[in-house]
Interface confidence: medium
């Protein structure tokens, strides 16, 4: 397998939890607009999941632009962990568990899970890829843990893996420990495989940043994101070399990498938008 010849590093990159956005504009890329002023503003970066500074030109642009860091945080970040822990301790379900399953208005159907308040269990459904509501989970485990009754929620058995929500492929779940690696390649290498909105079944490869390998997926023929390569070699060249291994005392060992000009595309499959 040429993939193994390419590099023998085992990637143990940590995986961020599903991105849950309060407003869809939080997913827009920073847009300085056509004017030439130099104004310090803040935007929400979906890749780092933080509010960051950028220079705004003074006109046009988009709604992902805030006067202050606080305003940005207020509009685009939510403390999911605290909210979920609190509700678990109180043995209450978050309100969104009682919402009906909502595919949203898009047509990029992917498998997701929702809590069905009628049957009192998590069930599978097809999510269109945008809008919808927060009763929408990437994995069955996450849905069970947050919304189902039971003393300890759902316990996965001794494999520590999860179902990938994009294409139902089974991929190892990353351990939630400090990462030994940093990714410095193109940002789209960290996005999930995205079938897109059409109905074709083209053989493509995407970089799975959790396991550090290029994996096949079926591309629909349109839409999707840039984590989409016609060959495994192309995928490896673009993404595999982007990891920098950390060693103790903060030192870095660099691996060779090729960088493409970054064009940020948003993988809407990973974005949960609250209905407004």
């Amino acid at each position: 397998d040429s993939e193994e010849d390419e590099e023998h590093t085992i990637i143990t990159d940590t995986e961020l939890p599903p991105l849950k956005l309060m407003h869809s504009f939080c997913a827009f890329k920073a847009d300085d607009g056509p004017c030439k002023a130099i104004m310090k503003r803040f935007f929400f970066n979906i890749f780092t999941r933080q509010c960051e500074e950028f220079i705004y030109g003074g006109c046009e642009g988009n709604q992902n632009r805030f006067e202050s860091l606080e305003e940005c945080k207020k509009m685009c970040t939510r403390d999911n962990a605290n909210r979920i822990i609190k509700t678990t301790l109180q043995q209450e379900k978050p309100d969104f568990c009682f919402l009906e399953e909502d595919p949203g208005i898009c047509r990029g159907y992917i498998t997701r899970y929702f809590y069905n308040n009628q049957t009192k269990q998590c069930e599978r459904f097809k999510y269109g890829g945008c809008l919808g509501n927060m009763n929408n989970f990437e994995t069955l485990e996450e849905c069970k843990n947050i919304c189902e009754d039971g003393p300890n929620g759902f316990q996965v058995d001794n494999y520590g893996t999860q179902l990938n929500a994009v294409n139902n492929s089974l991929t190892p779940q990353s351990t939630k420990v400090p990462s030994l690696f940093e990714f410095h390649g193109p940002s789209w290498c960290l996005t999930p495989a995205d079938r897109g909105l059409c109905r074709a079944n083209e053989n493509r490869f995407y970089y799975n940043s959790v396991i550090g390998k290029c994996r096949p997926f079926k591309y629909s023929g349109c839409g999707g994101n840039e984590n989409n390569f016609t060959s495994k070699q192309e995928c490896l060249r673009a993404c595999k070399k982007g990891f920098i291994q950390r060693i103790s005392k903060g030192g870095l060992i660099k691996t060779k990498r090729k960088r493409k000009k970054q064009r940020v595309k948003i993988a809407y499959e990973e974005i949960f938008v609250k209905n407004m």
Partner: antibody, heavy 119, light 107 residues
Framework: EVQLVESGGGLVQPGGSLRLSCAAS????????LDWVRQAPGKGLEWVGD????????LYNQKFKGRFTISRDNAKNSLYLQMNSLRAEDTAVYYC????????????WGQGTLVTVSS | DIVMTQSHKFMSTSVGDRVSITCKAS??????VAWYQQKPGQSPRLLIY???TRHTGVPDRFTGCGSGTDYTLTISSVQAEDLALYYC?????????FGGGTKLEMK
Amino acid sequence: EVQLVESGGGLVQPGGSLRLSCAASGYTFTDYNLDWVRQAPGKGLEWVGDINPINGATLYNQKFKGRFTISRDNAKNSLYLQMNSLRAEDTAVYYCARYYGDYDAMDYWGQGTLVTVSS
Amino acid sequence: DIVMTQSHKFMSTSVGDRVSITCKASQDVHTAVAWYQQKPGQSPRLLIYWASTRHTGVPDRFTGCGSGTDYTLTISSVQAEDLALYYCQQHYTTPYTFGGGTKLEMK
């Protein structure tokens, strides 16, 4: 060649238990979810539930939850259906089927095993 | 649960005929519909998934279409080996549910 072979069917009394097995071969067992579907004599198909072979996460048709349990043994490439408190209306051919995520459909089916619940 | 209704339990046809089998969902299933063929004494065989995509090895005389709640499986020129039971199934949400089946038989 993908093959799914069910076994364990037979005659059982009402209230009794039975464990069905499905041996999978011809593909990587942990790459696909597996489903159980049943078909009563002369009737249509009814989905029972499915399992993610890697982590054992299961989804059930609410109708069977509590009485039926789906499990698997990755070392043996095998899927199981434990059926308890059986009733006459559980009489059916039970099929195991591979659930292919790219299709969101069951692309390979076993030949089925007949379960008869009768006194 | 989503109810899938195949209004015709039986359909009579002749070799070479064009036949359409219909299926209606009790709610919008967003094209998440599969069609299966089952011959007597055999297990079901996947024909179509996502309403219109033919499974590998399925002859091109079988086509599927539909959206929302209404779906159709069409056999453009029926062959003798096509005489079987046909089931639609929604894979939009669990529990996955099947139609009652339509038996294609010779006139």
